[in-house]
Interface confidence: medium
């Protein structure tokens, strides 16, 4: 996978009347990075991870450019002429990547009310947009508004091109986020869920990257999909994931099922604890 | 590729005890599925006596429940049948074999229970 | 304990015949535990078909089973000549685990 830096902007009009306030979040590598969301924000790191990658003393630079580009989108906001009652938000994703190879992608993608209307290849700065008439009539909308001051526009894309992927190699330098595999720690526990059936759950935390395989055997063999219950790879706030996986079986059978983890090349078989249940819940 | 490989006496006296190691390479014992002992008698009939699962636990057939114990070497990758006060009866060929569909098979050792 | 019962406990066979081997319980079984084994003349038992009617890696599609609770089946479509050999059913449901006594399999 390439390293990443996604950064997502929102702004809000209430009425016509474009908010003063804005929201930014930036993820590094998919995790949650930077947070920041007053117009006089201070970027805040996302866990003890994001100050890891940032150092000392160094979120003013990131306050001082999320606070700019917020501004930009405030005003680009104003732009769009048909503006209705009520609240709307106008959503800008920038997202830049480092290949294995060294290649990189940059692109831009604009939203109206949740609606993507308008996406830039920032390296070719060739300009996409859906077919419905809507968000045509946006994205000329917001394209024309982008283009009154062509030089700035030229300038202005190629320095954010250029400047994402700067900022990425900077945090790529801490060498806290330098590709890595980080084991996930592997704990299954059981809960009691009708007479004579048990609910056992296996959770999978702290590995990196997202990927992985977790899954319920019996006497060895993957049980259907039908039979499982997943829950989503969810970042856990130290750069690295989370996940569980739980199904029903009957008491005493413990010993023939097994929860099975592969990460990263690396594949791993856990047992049922046995014993009292002790935790009265269900997954169901 | 997985192979379970049993070793043992070959001729036990009556009334002594019994001991049979199976030895696996190419998966660990501690990792998934059940290791069973199995025997055949010599009109062929097939008898599951116990297993130690993965994850330690031991099931035996109740007709041998007084006499049998499987036990493991995890660091070796081998577990063991011992059974107790053998006679004649217990003369039979032992396999040992992997999982609850049994997918794996030693190639079995062959016991006398003779004076 | 649950026992299974096989039939016919032998039989002979032409090659390209098709074979019928039926295995009876005294208990409802899972199909999940139910497995059929191959045992060639001086070999030990080879797993033929697991959970009823899924073929063991390297067994011919020749070979097939079905069944559910307390009746269970293995068919052989074509008799080959290696398919000369002992054919035992058996149950994982509950313990103690139990084999079928056997169906000798032999070739005209």
């Known amino acids: 996978e390439p390293h990443s830096l996604r950064y997502n902007l929102t702004v809000l009009s209430w009425d016509g009347s474009v908010q003063s306030g804005f929201l930014t979040e930036v993820h590094l590598d998919g995790q949650p990075f930077l947070r920041c969301d007053r117009q006089k924000c201070r970027a805040k790191p996302q866990g003890q991870w994001a100050e890891d990658v940032l150092g000392n003393k160094t979120w003013d630079r990131e306050t001082r450019d999320l606070t700019g580009n917020g501004k930009d989108l405030r005003m680009t906001l104003a732009h769009i002429k048909d503006q209705k009652e009520g609240l709307h938000s106008l959503q800008e994703i920038r997202v830049c990547e480092i290949h294995e190879d060294n290649s990189t992608r940059s692109s831009q993608h604009f939203y109206y009310d949740g609606e993507l209307f308008l996406s830039q290849n920032l390296e070719t700065k060739e300009w996409t947009m859906p077919q419905s008439s809507r968000a045509q009539t946006l994205a000329m909308n917001v394209r024309n508004f982008l283009k009154e001051d062509a030089m700035k526009t030229k300038t202005h894309y190629h320095a954010m091109h250029a400047d994402c992927l700067q900022e990425l190699r900077r945090y790529l330098k801490s060498g806290v986020v330098l590709r890595r595999t980080v084991p996930p720690m592997v704990n299954v526990t059981r809960s009691e869920a009708s007479e004579g059936n048990i609910t056992v759950t296996c959770r999978a935390s702290g590995f990196y990257p997202w990927n992985i395989t977790l899954s319920w055997r019996q006497d060895g063999v993957s049980l259907s999909h039908d039979t499982q219950q997943w829950g989503d790879v969810l970042p856990d706030g130290n750069g690295t994931y989370q996940t569980w996986v739980a199904t029903r079986i009957c008491q005493g059978e413990e010993q023939r099922f097994t929860c099975y983890m592969e990460h990263s090349g690396n594949h791993s078989t856990h047992p049922v604890p046995s014993g009292k249940v002790l935790v009265l819940q269900s997954h169901w | 590729d997985v192979q379970l490989q049993e070793s043992g006496p070959g001729l036990v006296k009556p009334s002594q005890s019994l001991s049979l190691t199976c030895t696996v390479t190419g998966y660990s014992i501690t990792s998934d599925y059940a290791w069973n002992w199995i025997r055949q008698f010599p009109g062929n009939k097939l008898e599951w006596m116990g297993f130690?699962?993965?994850?330690?636990?031991?099931k035996y057939n109740p007709s041998l429940k007084s006499r049998i114990s499987i036990t493991r070497d995890t660091s070796e990758n081998q577990f063991f049948l011992q059974l107790n006060s053998v006679t004649s009866e217990d003369t039979a060929t032992y396999y040992c074999?992997?999982?609850?569909?049994?997918?794996?098979w030693g190639q079995g050792t062959t016991l006398t229970v003779s004076s | 304990e649950i026992v299974l019962t096989q039939s016919p406990t032998t039989m002979a066979a032409s090659p390209g015949e098709k074979i019928t081997i039926t295995c009876s319980a005294t208990s409802s079984i899972s199909s999940i535990y139910f497995h059929w084994y191959q045992q060639r003349p001086g070999f030990s038992p080879k797993l033929l078909i697991y959970?009823?009617?899924n073929l063991a890696s390297g067994v011919p599609a020749r070979f097939s089973g079905s069944g559910s609770g307390t009746s269970y089946s293995l068919t052989i479509g074509t008799m080959e000549a290696e398919d000369v050999a002992t054919y035992y059913c058996q149950q994982g449901t509950t313990i103690p685990f139990t084999f079928g006594s056997g169906t000798k399999l032999e070739i005209k």
């Open positions: 959970r009823t009617s």
């Open positions: 074999a992997r999982g609850y569909g049994f997918d794996y």
């Open positions: 130690v699962s993965y994850s330690g636990t031991t």
